[in-house]
Interface confidence: medium
């Protein structure tokens, strides 16, 4: 019997969804040469959840309307989970003077407008890094800017108007660094069609080694959205990302670097990235810095993370201590480091997925170990997981909603630590909540920096 139109539409949506998840989220359907094995429905569901989580949609695991709308939105062709070319965590340019060449020009715009848009797009990144870009007209450039349609020699065919607008390759020789723009789009200097400057800023981010961001305000967010180019600025996330690869501009710094200067400890708006006890001390992490607070003493000292642990990154996002083992776990993105007796253990970082998180979890917001239960609580967005440190596995029945089980806390938190045998201290922005886990309620509301006598 022929399919009725709604079944047919549903089938098309599923096929479209599969294709999208294959391209951008590494779904391995394996319906082609390697094997005729069918993927499990769970794998598809998990990939939908991963996509929804990354793009800030409601995580349902279903191809619902908002998910399909997002899948149809014009976007960059680089995957959100990495298959493309060694981004993220891959190569960077090992020099500060980088050349680019415009291989050919789109007929949609004047040549001078193309030159200007591309030059301004490079300038966006040189403003916040030590990188200097210069255009060459002949010879081999580090970054080649190409307008092409359909299949164009790099295994990543463009798809006509809409859909994929452009893609770029991470730093490297040959095709490395090159940025390709789909000639089937209508490229413009304004809000009509597809704005070349905005798209180029994004693609050059890839050319410099950045992956996609899940922050909708970031220029490195995967989907295209026009913003006023006269007031356009990189988000803090974009700046943090690029400066983690290249550092900040050494001279003529034109844009403030959120990680550059030591944050003011008594700023009433101060928030922390992660907090944990280490023996009788409390470590407060923020950007490249940490403050050390020795219990019951008013004095605190600020240090660079790299001065204590040179092999660790800045921007630690979560931390917890198992005091009985003299172990501290530090988390950033999908990796974690183990510190034993204040020394980093070899063979780290490792993947957070070794704890048993599903694939869509890409970073941990906060973590805390409770020695009374020998359990670690991991907070991710508005949910939390509970991990049995003895059995080295996640407890069943998780994740659960933070707001449901921690009265008055949430929906999301920045940091948490355990102290005095009965309290969790939760940090949310510039606020801190002392939470009695036996009474299961907040017992005090404080400023985040209350530990410093501010």
């Amino acid at each position: 019997l022929p399919l009725n139109s709604s079944t047919s539409l549903e089938k098309n949506n599923v096929l479209f969804g599969e294709r999208y998840l294959e391209k951008f989220y590494g779904l391995e359907i394996n319906k082609l040469p390697v094997t005729k094995m069918k993927y499990s429905g769970n794998l598809m569901k998990e990939k939908i959840q991963e996509m929804q989580h990354f793009l800030g949609l409601k995580v349902t695991g279903q191809l619902d309307t908002s998910t399909l709308e997002m899948m149809h939105a014009p976007r960059c062709g680089v995957p959100d989970v990495h298959h493309f070319r060694e981004m993220p965590g891959g190569p960077v340019w090992r020099k500060h003077y980088i050349t680019y060449r415009i291989n050919n020009y789109t007929p949609d715009m004047n040549r001078e407008d193309v030159d200007y848009a591309i030059r301004k797009a490079f300038q966006v990144w040189s403003n916040v890094t030590p990188l200097k870009f210069s255009k060459i007209n002949t010879g081999m450039a580090d970054i080649l800017v190409v307008f092409a349609r359909g299949a164009h020699g790099d295994f990543h065919a463009f798809d006509g108007k809409g859909g994929i607008l452009a893609h770029a390759f991470g730093p490297g020789s040959g095709i490395g660094g090159d940025a390709h723009f789909d000639e089937d789009e209508f490229w413009t200097t304004h809000s009509g069609g597809t704005n070349l400057f905005l798209t180029a800023v994004h693609e050059i981010g890839h050319s410099l080694g950045l992956g996609h961001s899940s922050d909708p305000k970031a220029v490195m967010f995967p989907t295209y959205k026009y913003v006023d180019i006269n007031t356009f600025r990189l988000s803090a996330d974009d700046i943090r990302g690029i400066q983690s690869l290249y550092g900040d501009p050494k001279e003529n710094q034109r844009l403030p670097n959120p990680d550059n200067s030591e944050p003011a400890l008594c700023d009433p708006n101060l928030s922390f990235d992660a907090v944990t006890t280490v023996g009788n001390k409390i470590f407060f992490f923020k950007d490249r810095f940490f403050w050390l607070k020795v219990s019951e003493r008013p004095k605190t000292s600020v240090n660079l993370i790299s001065s204590l642990w040179p092999t660790l990154p800045s921007g630690i996002e979560a931390a917890y201590e198992i005091e009985a083992r003299n172990q501290v776990f530090l988390f950033k993105d999908d990796k974690y480091w183990l510190i034993s007796n204040l020394r980093p253990e070899p063979n780290y970082p490792k993947s957070i997925h070794s704890f048993g998180f599903p694939n869509f979890v890409k970073k941990i917001d906060a973590a805390v170990f409770n020695p009374r239960f020998y359990r670690t609580y991991f907070f991710v967005d508005n949910q939390y997981w509970r991990y049995d440190e003895r059995r080295q596995m996640m407890d069943p029945g998780y994740p659960k909603l933070i707001t449901k089980n921690f009265q008055g806390i949430g929906p999301k938190i920045d940091a948490v630590f355990y102290s005095k045998n009965k309290y969790y201290y939760f940090f949310q922005g510039s606020n801190q909540f002392e939470y009695d886990f036996l009474l299961q309620r907040i017992t005090k509301t404080l400023k985040s920096n209350s530990w410093f006598g501010c």
Epitope: E22, L32, P33, T35, E86, G150, A151, H156
Partner: antibody, heavy 126, light 108 residues
Framework: EVQLLESGGGLVQPGGSLRLSCAAS???????QMWWVRQAPGKGLEWVS?????????GYADSVKGRFTISRDNSKNTLYLQMNSLRAEDTAVYYC???????????????????WGQGTLVTVSS | DIQMTQSPGILSLSPGDRATLSCRAS???????LAWYQQRPGQSPRLLIY???SRATGIPDRFSGSGSGTDFTLIISRLEPEDFASYYC?????????FGPGTKVDIK
């Protein structure tokens, strides 16, 4: 620079076993589908086996099904082919190959090879 | 399985000549999922063409591919000394993938 270095080939008697290894470098191994392709002396190319990027799915040519096992260790950037119950007709140069993520207008294909190793010779003879 | 045949088996030509190599599939190859590889004596194969007509990175423009369905062609417009080698077609639209037996281009 992408490099694929096969090892483990050699002379083996019919019915014997060999384990081939392929050390990969110069790219993010864990994100690529990988294949073994073989070439009998003076003959053409034959796809032998493939494995998905995570190792979660595998496939085999009918001629080796049940005798060969493909596997990978992404933490070591290494691809393996365990060959049991070897036959004279398995004599060939075995190439370790990388399969790029190729998208065209009709979707996703992991179906062609962009890099080949130098090959390792397996000779099955009594 | 999709069977691939190539003709001629051997093509004897001189440098500067135009070479036309043919590849035929036993059934239609979906989405022009056909690749061509070159194998020089004593070396591993290398990818020349994919998607029937797209040149792989670094491949000179004297190599061009065409065709769809069951009939595909590789043309080398002007043979250079390094082009004398064996050429294999491969389909990847059906499972399992299959290679043709090859065409050897040798010097006349």
């Amino acid at each position: 620079e992408v490099q694929l270095l096969e090892s483990g080939g050699g002379l083996v008697q019919p019915g014997g076993s060999l384990r081939l290894s392929c050390a990969a470098s110069g790219f993010t191994f864990s994100t690529y589908q990988m294949w073994w392709v073989r070439q009998a002396p003076g003959k053409g190319l034959e796809w032998v086996s493939g494995i998905s990027s995570s190792g979660g799915a595998t496939g085999y040519a009918d001629s080796v099904k049940g005798r060969f096992t493909i596997s990978r260790d992404n933490s070591k950037n290494t691809l393996y082919l365990q060959m049991n119950s070897l036959r004279a007709e398995d004599t060939a140069v075995y190439y370790c190959t990388r399969v790029p993520h190729y998208y065209d207008s009709s979707g996703y294909y992991g179906g062609l090879v962009d890099y080949w190793g130098q090959g390792t010779l397996v000779t099955v003879s009594s | 399985d999709i069977q691939m045949t190539q003709s001629p088996g051997i093509l004897s030509l001189s440098p500067g000549d135009r070479a036309t190599l043919s590849c035929r599939a036993s059934q239609s190859v979906t989405s022009s999922s056909l690749a061509w590889y070159q194998q020089r004596p004593g070396q591993s194969p290398r990818l020349l063409i994919y998607g029937a007509s797209s040149r792989a990175t670094g491949i000179p423009d004297r190599f061009s591919g065409s065709g769809s369905g069951t009939d595909f062609t590789l043309i080398i417009s002007r043979l250079e000394p390094e082009d004398f080698a064996s050429y294999y077609c491969q389909q990847y639209g059906g499972s399992p993938i299959t290679f043709g037996p090859g065409t050897k281009v040798d010097i006349k």
